[in-house]
């Protein structure tokens, strides 16, 4: 039988955006495979990603059951083929992940400006309410459904002809802002959760700019 010893996983890292949650680890396996287990603090260990040679495991299905729970994962290493294990008899090698609380730690994905529409000297800017993989009553919840009023959007807007940015905030997905007639404006939005200590801002959206509104304004 082989002489390459089984090694424990290391650098266990949670990668999570809008609750899509993947556990990653090292090393790339040589003569070994991995199985991942996930648990809540009070729950039981559930195996996922059985006997895999991947170094990542999608745990979204488990964490979306309760995004406010704190989860812990562990990665077991098993010898592949006829390779001896370094674990003491009956003791499989495993490594624990850091704790992970999805509601507090999932990264906010880059938001998308869905539309903007001018009404007189006001512009209504709508942010797309992104669907998550969190389910309730067999339907997928949006980011707003999950975070409610904890989720704030900041709008950055400026005249195309100048660099001075203005900001607006909303705890819905819509902004109504005042603009100058006949001017082109550019918009970018960012999701923010002020109640978080870390990881509280998303990347800014792709900037979208208006075209000349003269026809819209009837000039």
């Amino acid at each position: 039988s082989g002489t390459t010893n089984t090694v424990a996983a290391y650098n266990l890292t949670w990668k999570s955006t809008n609750f899509k949650t993947i556990l990653e680890w090292e090393p790339k396996p040589v003569n070994q495979v991995y199985t991942v287990q996930i648990s809540t603090k009070s729950g039981d260990w559930k195996s996922k990603c059985f006997y895999t040679t991947d170094t990542e495991c999608d745990l979204t299905d488990e964490i979306v059951k309760d995004v406010k729970q704190t989860y812990l994962a562990r990665v077991f290493s098993y010898p592949a083929g006829n390779v001896e294990s370094t674990g003491s008899a009956g003791e499989p090698l495993y490594e624990n992940s850091p704790e992970f609380t999805p509601y507090l730690e999932t990264n906010l994905g880059q938001p998308t400006i869905q539309s903007f529409e001018q009404v007189g000297t006001k512009v209504n800017v709508t942010v797309e309410d992104e669907r998550t993989l969190v389910r309730r009553n067999n339907t997928f919840l949006s980011l707003r459904d999950v975070f409610g009023k904890d989720l704030i959007y900041t709008l950055y807007y400026w005249k195309s002809s100048s660099s001075g940015k203005k900001t607006a905030k909303t705890n819905t997905n819509e902004f109504l802002i005042d603009v100058d007639k006949g001017e082109n404006y550019c918009f970018s939005v960012q999701a923010v959760i002020f109640s978080r200590k870390t990881n509280h801002k998303s990347p800014e959206s792709i900037t979208k700019c208006t075209e000349q509104w003269k026809s819209v304004l009837g000039e």
């Epitope: 559930k46 195996s47 040679t53």
Partner: antibody
């Protein structure tokens, strides 16, 4: 339809080796793990190991480590289980069973018909 | 290895009776448990997966449940064709292990 067809019965002497085949049909061979389970006469079921047909990676129960080798031939959708250094207590029916994938439950939903291996001097 | 203690090892019941088999895991295995039926001279057949999910095509008189490390398999109304040995199997920990089996006979 989905099925697993195994090779015929074998009679072997102690110390010899036996190689049992299991041909899969009716589904995408690479998408499901294959397991080997054995059953001694009048006894219960015992899991021997698993092979991932996609990459050929195997994991064996410690009891069989060093004596069992599982391989696959993707061109014929066939998996093989070779057990060496046979002894009388290896007399059993050997089953291949399709069971899950890396993301699915390891439930054996399709079984071969079984191959009787008799070890006798 | 995880020990799966199945009981009783055999039972005799009348047609139409409710039959219950239990399987106890030596440690927490979540709901990672399957139930199989094996008729004499045949390969096992999957009936229940993940403790309580009925495999496609399996009659609804078969059911499974979990309470902690205790798992229960029930035949709500025993039929003559249910004469077989039933096995539980856990897959939450390596190596995968089976219970010792329960032989069900008709009185």
């Amino acid at each position: 339809q989905v099925q697993l067809v195994q090779s015929g019965a074998e009679v072997k002497k102690p110390g010899a080796s036996v190689k049992v085949s299991c041909k899969a049909s009716g589904y995408t061979f690479a998408n499901y793990y294959m397991h080997w389970v054995r059953q001694a006469p009048g006894q219960g079921l015992e899991w021997m190991g698993i092979i991932n047909p996609s990459g050929g990676i195997t994991v064996y129960a410690q009891k069989f480590q060093g004596r069992v080798t599982m391989t696959r031939d993707t061109s014929t959708s066939t998996v093989y289980m070779e057990l060496s250094s046979l002894r009388s207590e290896d007399t059993a029916v050997y089953y291949c069973a399709r069971g899950g994938s890396k993301v699915a439950a390891l439930a054996f939903d399709i079984w071969g018909q079984g191959t009787m291996v008799t070890v006798s001097s | 290895d995880i020990q799966m203690t199945q009981s009783p090892s055999s039972l005799s019941a009348s047609v139409g009776d409710r039959v219950t088999i239990t399987c106890q895991a030596s440690q927490d295995i979540s709901n990672s448990l399957n139930w199989y039926q094996q008729k004499p001279g045949k390969a096992p057949k999957l009936l229940i997966y993940d403790a309580s999910n009925l495999e496609t095509g399996v009659p609804s008189r078969f059911s499974g449940s979990r309470s902690g490390t205790d798992f229960t398999f029930t035949i709500s109304s025993l039929q003559p064709e249910d004469i077989a040995t039933y096995y539980c199997q856990q897959y939450n920990f390596h190596p995968l292990t089976f219970g010792g089996g329960t032989k069900v006979e008709i009185k």
